[in-house]
């Protein structure tokens, strides 16, 4: 027999969850023990079943999770998972703060991505930092030329999607370009979107031919310019 213990404590490190109103919140307390423990949830010290909550809650015992959709300010509080079996019990507190700011289009940090100059064969990183109340998704685009033109008949640029990702708010998103060639030169755009809209910022990558070995030693591998 064994008292309950956390199986993935690293997934429980984020104690404070500050989320915009309208978002979905998920708390998890994955545990094990012998006999298999049960889990119940408290809100501010009281048994919590979500009866008084618009939209209710989802309890997924096999995932040791509590899910609340479309959180509102009245959902703020301390949420405790209480895991117990015949041998013992453990508990963990999560703090939920619901932010009421007006959700806005993603804001991209000025100057990112930055114009960059690199040498053929080198590696390049383009950075994009996104601030967004609603969870943002991101795309990296490369502007391309088709039949000698950068723009279609409708006046919009031709682009190729290089990468698509969902990210957490305020994360830095990186586009890695390995072993660049002359064909990699051009305009790159970081596009961030959320439920309100899209925001774009672009940068140019200049790729120089391999440098003459007689002066390579004095030159940096990649130069970054604004």
């Amino acid at each position: 027999q064994q008292a309950p213990y956390w199986t993935h404590p690293q997934r429980m490190e984020k104690k404070l969850h500050a989320v915009p109103a309208g978002n979905t919140v998920k708390f998890r307390c994955p545990a094990a023990g012998n006999p298999t423990p049960t889990i119940r949830w408290l809100k501010d010290g009281q048994a919590f079943h979500g009866e008084n909550r618009i939209g209710g809650i989802r309890l997924r015992h096999q995932h040791w999770s509590l899910v609340m959709e479309s959180v509102v300010p009245s959902d703020r509080g301390t949420y405790t998972c209480l895991v117990e079996n015949a041998v013992g019990s453990i508990r963990y507190n999560y703090l939920l703060d619901v932010l009421e700011r007006s959700p806005h289009r993603p804001i991209l940090q000025a100057g990112l991505p930055a114009n960059t100059t690199a040498v053929v064969g080198s590696d390049v990183e383009l950075l994009c930092k996104v601030y967004s109340d609603a969870q943002p998704h991101i795309q990296w685009l490369k502007h391309i030329v088709i039949n000698g033109s950068s723009f279609g008949a409708d006046g919009f640029p031709y682009v190729q999607v290089l990468k698509t990702a969902d990210i957490n708010s305020s994360e830095v998103e990186v586009l890695y370009l390995r072993n660049v060639s002359a064909e990699d030169a051009g305009e790159y755009t970081c596009l961030a979107g959320n439920s309100i809209g899209l925001s774009y910022q672009s940068a140019w990558l200049t790729v120089l031919p391999e440098e003459d070995p007689t002066w390579t030693a004095a030159a940096p591998e990649a130069r970054y310019t604004d």
């Epitope: 007006s102 289009r105 795309q139 979107g193």
Partner: antibody, heavy 124, light 112 residues
Framework: EVQLLESGGGVVQPGRSLRLSCAAS????????MHWVRQAPGKGLEWVAV????????YYADSVKGRFTISRDNSKNTLSLQMNSLRVEDTAIYYC?????????????????WGQGTMVTVSS | DIVMTQSPLSLPVTPGEPASISCTSS???????????VYWYLQKPGQSPQVLIY???NRFSGVPDRFSGSGSGTDFTLKISRVEAEDVGVYYC?????????FGGGTKVEIK
């Protein structure tokens, strides 16, 4: 052809509930945020709610918060608005509007496609 | 919330003559990406609103070039270079930078 078709409007008494639906066709519904906008008779336009492409984010106008719930079923290309505790001032034509896409867009990033609207009348 | 104020309320026009509608926002609609997120719509009698202009000055596909949008971060103008009979209806400006999305009160354009 890109199209949004609302349904579910009607006459209802104050305090009662109504559920509006919007059927989308001609585009990848699951890649777009969706909005509801309403227009009271003879009045201007008022934004009501938005839901993200995957349903994880929802935002509401203060005038409907706590009473209305926006939802979507991407498998059926359907947007819904559950309206509870209806008030006389909720009387309006309700429009379903396509929002921002999940990626690069040629032209405006949303609010370009509107349905024809469905009329909701709250009256005793 | 961002307040959008439109003027005039009503605009009687003569076909072939120019017309101009103003819209002011209570906060700048110039975003960090350099775009200004104001839209203009026309709602013809008995119809849904239709986009004319997006992102301050871009004409929506199929919109005649007699329509143009201009302005700064808080002051916007929709111009019709030569009004036609089919242009009658109510014109709305809208901010699309943050929720709640807000509309101007509308300008009713009618033929004199």
């Amino acid at each position: 052809e890109v199209q949004l078709l609302e349904s579910g409007g009607g006459v209802v008494q104050p305090g009662r509930s109504l559920r509006l639906s919007c059927a989308a066709s001609g585009f990848t519904f699951s890649s777009y945020a969706m909005h509801w906008v309403r227009q009271a008779p003879g009045k201007g336009l008022e934004w009501v709610a938005v839901i993200s492409y995957d349903g994880s984010n929802k935002y509401y106008a203060d005038s409907v918060k706590g009473r209305f719930t926006i939802s979507r079923d991407n498998s059926k290309n359907t947007l819904s608005l559950q309206m509870n505790s209806l008030r006389v001032e909720d009387t309006a034509i309700y429009y379903c509007v396509r929002g921002a896409g999940r990626g690069y867009t040629y032209g405006p990033d949303g609010f370009d496609i509107w349905g024809q609207g469905t009329m909701v009348t709250v009256s005793s | 919330d961002i307040v959008m104020t439109q003027s005039p309320l009503s605009l009687p026009v003569t076909p072939g003559e120019p017309a101009s509608i103003s819209c002011t926002s209570s906060r700048s609609l110039l975003h960090s990406d350099g775009k200004t997120y104001v839209y203009w719509y026309l709602q013809k009698p008995g119809q849904s609103p239709q986009v004319l202009i997006y992102e301050l000055s871009n004409r929506f596909s199929g919109v005649p070039d007699r329509f143009s949008g201009s302005g700064s971060g808080t002051d916007f103008t929709l111009k019709i270079s030569r009004v036609e009979a089919e242009d009658v209806g109510v014109y709305y400006c809208m901010q699309y930078i943050e929720a709640p999305l807000t509309f101007g009160g509308g300008t009713k354009v009618e033929i004199k």
